[in-house]
């Protein structure tokens, strides 16, 4: 069970608590102080604040998710004090929003819709862990008296009147408020003064629902148990001073006998189940560096062994309006370069014994896509690209240009907005990709902007492997291989045949295969073969060959 209110009011836990609901902070709650940007573990030095007798709540809203206050009554167990207050940081949602627990599979819980109801059943005993969330409404009436708004009690109709007395003073039952439940179920609250002091309750009854907070001393590595009572009680064997039991060893049980002059024997025997040492737990950032721009992972690590039953340890996280009942949480879809605060606590047997707040700044995100303004070829061997940089932070640019299957990449300074590409191949399609990148926990590349251009034409290279062979006395066969670089749109081979300085033949073919007939016998000829790409002729390949005397 979680801590319960003392007879005269709600007593908060000593530690700052995770904000888990949506209403403004009650005046009696201790909120988280600002977290460090790394990790803050509490040293439990906060003072207790509690409601004074005249502040005792007389109305409980059954739909309130955090102000779970109710009368401490004879024969009816009191409402559990939530460990975790509300709106303690700027990230908690505004009024009207609610937090929601995210836990794993609860093996015993059932999703059984009942007719006319749309709420998941919450039968006591069917929860995987005893929740201290204020996201759970005031406990069911089987265990708690909770009074509704306008003092209309949510109790079944009775056949006779019942009077329940709630204490509002340390002097037990000296002054009281009485709640009368009529057969209709409505409650009438009136204040009366009782002149005579009735018989005292037993200390076992009076302190039946006593709650304890554990304070850890990091130097001695021992706990102090603070008894949540408003009077100075006595403990057997003088084991306590000022309602505190000192020098408790982690994971050991200690028995304390509690008595007071306002109650009679038998004393209340309180078994203190001491939690593990605080420093044995460390809140660890488990975020993968590759995903650190949009995700957060936090995990409680057990960094030393202890003998406490780990089954009794529960972990709780709150990040914004999201609550998790897990040892490890992973949040996704976050904004890069933002600070996010997560509060967490660890409970042992539903008693909180440590907490931590972490502010995590997400990593730099991938930069945006640069905006290409233009991208064109200025000449056969040159191109130019200009762009606007992306909005988000980045360190440099990478410009890649791809021709056919070849790819070249350049690293460009972040201040550049134009780049001239040199030594390009003429009449070639270039696909350019430009992306910004940032070197953060890892290098993150932004989306690439793409463009393409085709360089201008240029003269083709020379044909090669040219041969001239005689096929008859006055005929020649001229062949050559295509140029290595065509550098233009078309493909045409030209052959010029000269005798002396006179052009005697000029032929053009699709292929470099010419049959030159009817030449003069015994004459020296110059054969010039070249490629023309539609825009430019290439350098000619020149060979000399002579015809022979006619054999006939």
């Amino acid at each position: 069970q979680s801590p319960t209110p003392s007879p005269t009011g709600l007593t908060t836990a000593k530690m700052p608590s995770v904000p888990l609901s949506s209403d403004p902070l009650p005046t009696h709650t201790t909120a988280f102080s600002p977290a460090s940007t790394f990790e803050r573990e509490n040293d439990f030095s906060e003072t207790t604040t509690s409601l004074s007798p005249d502040n005792t709540s007389t109305q409980v809203s059954p739909d309130s998710l955090d102000n779970a206050s109710a009368f401490n009554t004879t024969g009816v167990s009191s409402v559990q004090t939530p460990h975790l207050p509300t709106h303690a940081d700027s990230q908690t949602p505004s009024a009207g929003t609610d937090t929601q627990t995210f836990s794993g599979s609860a093996a015993n819980a059932k999703l059984n819709p009942t007719p006319g109801s749309n709420a998941i059943s919450d039968v006591p005993g069917e929860r995987s862990t005893a929740s201290t969330f204020p996201t759970d409404p005031v406990s069911p009436l089987t265990t708690t008296l909770s009074l509704a708004h306008h003092s209309s009690a949510a109790l079944p109709a009775r056949t006779s009147n019942t009077t329940i007395t709630a204490n509002t003073s340390d002097a037990y039952l000296n002054a009281s408020e009485t709640t009368t439940l009529s057969p209709s179920g409505s409650a009438v609250i009136s204040t009366t003064t009782i002149a005579t002091t009735p018989s005292k309750p037993t200390c076992d009854e009076k302190y039946a629902n006593i709650t304890v907070d554990y304070l850890y001393n990091k130097e001695t590595k021992l706990f102090t148990a603070k008894l949540n009572v408003n009077e100075n009680v006595e403990c057997g064997n003088n084991t306590c001073t000022n309602n505190e039991v000192h020098n408790l060893t982690e994971c050991k049980n200690a028995s304390v006998s509690i008595s007071h002059n306002s109650c009679t024997a038998p004393d209340k025997t309180l078994i203190l189940d001491v939690p593990p040492g605080v420093e044995k737990f460390q809140l660890h950032d488990c975020t993968q560096v590759e995903k650190a721009d949009t995700t957060i992972c936090l995990k409680w690590k057990n960094i030393e062994t202890f003998t406490c039953d780990t089954q009794n340890i529960t972990y709780r996280f709150q990040c914004g309006n999201m609550i998790f009942d897990n040892k490890e949480i992973k949040l996704e879809n976050l904004e890069p370069e933002h600070e996010y605060k997560c509060d967490s606590e660890i409970l042992y047997n539903n008693h909180k014994f440590t907490n931590a707040s972490k502010i995590i700044k997400t990593d730099f995100g991938s930069p945006g896509e640069p905006q290409i303004i233009f991208c064109r070829s200025e000449a056969a061997h040159q191109g130019v690209i200009t762009w606007n940089p992306p909005q988000r932070s980045f360190h440099n640019f990478t410009l890649c240009y791809i021709k056919e299957t070849e790819k070249d990449c350049l690293n460009l300074d972040k201040n550049l907005i134009k780049y001239d590409l040199q030594n390009l191949k003429p009449y070639t399609k270039y696909v350019l990709s430009l992306h910004a990148y940032i070197i953060a926990k890892v290098q993150r590349n932004g989306s690439a902007a793409m463009c393409h251009f085709t360089t201008k034409s240029a003269p083709p290279s020379q044909v090669w492997n040219m041969t001239v062979s005689m096929t008859s006395d006055n005929s020649m066969h001229v062949k050559c291989r295509p140029p290595r670089d065509r550098n233009g749109p078309h493909e045409r081979y030209h052959l010029e045949v000269e005798a002396g300085n006179t052009l005697v033949r000029n032929e053009s073919h699709k292929n470099c295969d010419f049959r030159v007939k009817d030449l003069q016998y015994s004459t020296d000829y110059t054969f010039k073969a070249y490629f023309h790409n539609g825009d430019y002729p290439g350098e000619p390949f020149i060979l000399h060959h002579s015809t022979s005397y006619n054999s006939k």
């Epitope: 739909d63 929003t97 709420a119 990040c319 976050l334 996010y340």
Partner: nanobody, 123 residues
Framework: EVQLEESGGGLVQPGGSLRLSCAAS????????MSWVRQAPGKGPERVAV???????????SYADSVRGRFTISRDNARSTLHLQMNSLKPEDTAVYYC?????????????WGQGTQVTVSS
């Protein structure tokens, strides 16, 4: 009155995809933490995805390990609709899927919830 109505369930082969939707009314949808909870026959409920607010990130999400990387939760505040995109479905994803909202006055671990939509993954 809080109303949540799921749709989009059905029979799908392993490796296939489904997109569940949940139409919400009766509360301020944009303020609420919304979840998809599933319950397989004979098993307890498992919250598979949740979407809420952390700092300025109003679409912060978290997933159960069993579905991370395959399921995507999203919300359309203008239409008060919650979605669950389920990819690479496995036979073990077979369950009734419920849309849940933790709104003021709701009880239980998961708050108010719909009638559910059956998802069956089988060849």
């Amino acid at each position: 009155e809080v109303q949540l109505e799921e749709s989009g369930g059905g029979l799908v082969q392993p490796g296939g995809s489904l997109r569940l939707s949940c139409a919400a009314s009766g509360f301020t949808f944009s303020n609420q933490v919304m979840s998809w909870v599933r319950q397989a026959p004979g098993k307890g409920p498992e919250r598979v995805a949740v979407i809420g607010s952390v700092g300025g990130a109003t679409g912060a999400t978290s997933y159960a390990d069993s579905v991370r990387g395959r399921f995507t939760i999203s919300r359309d505040n203008a239409r008060s609709t919650l979605h669950l995109q389920m990819n690479s479905l496995k036979p073990e994803d077979t369950a009734v899927y419920y849309c849940a909202a933790r709104v003021r006055g709701s009880t239980g671990d998961f708050g108010s919830w719909g009638q559910g939509t059956q998802v069956t993954v089988s060849s």
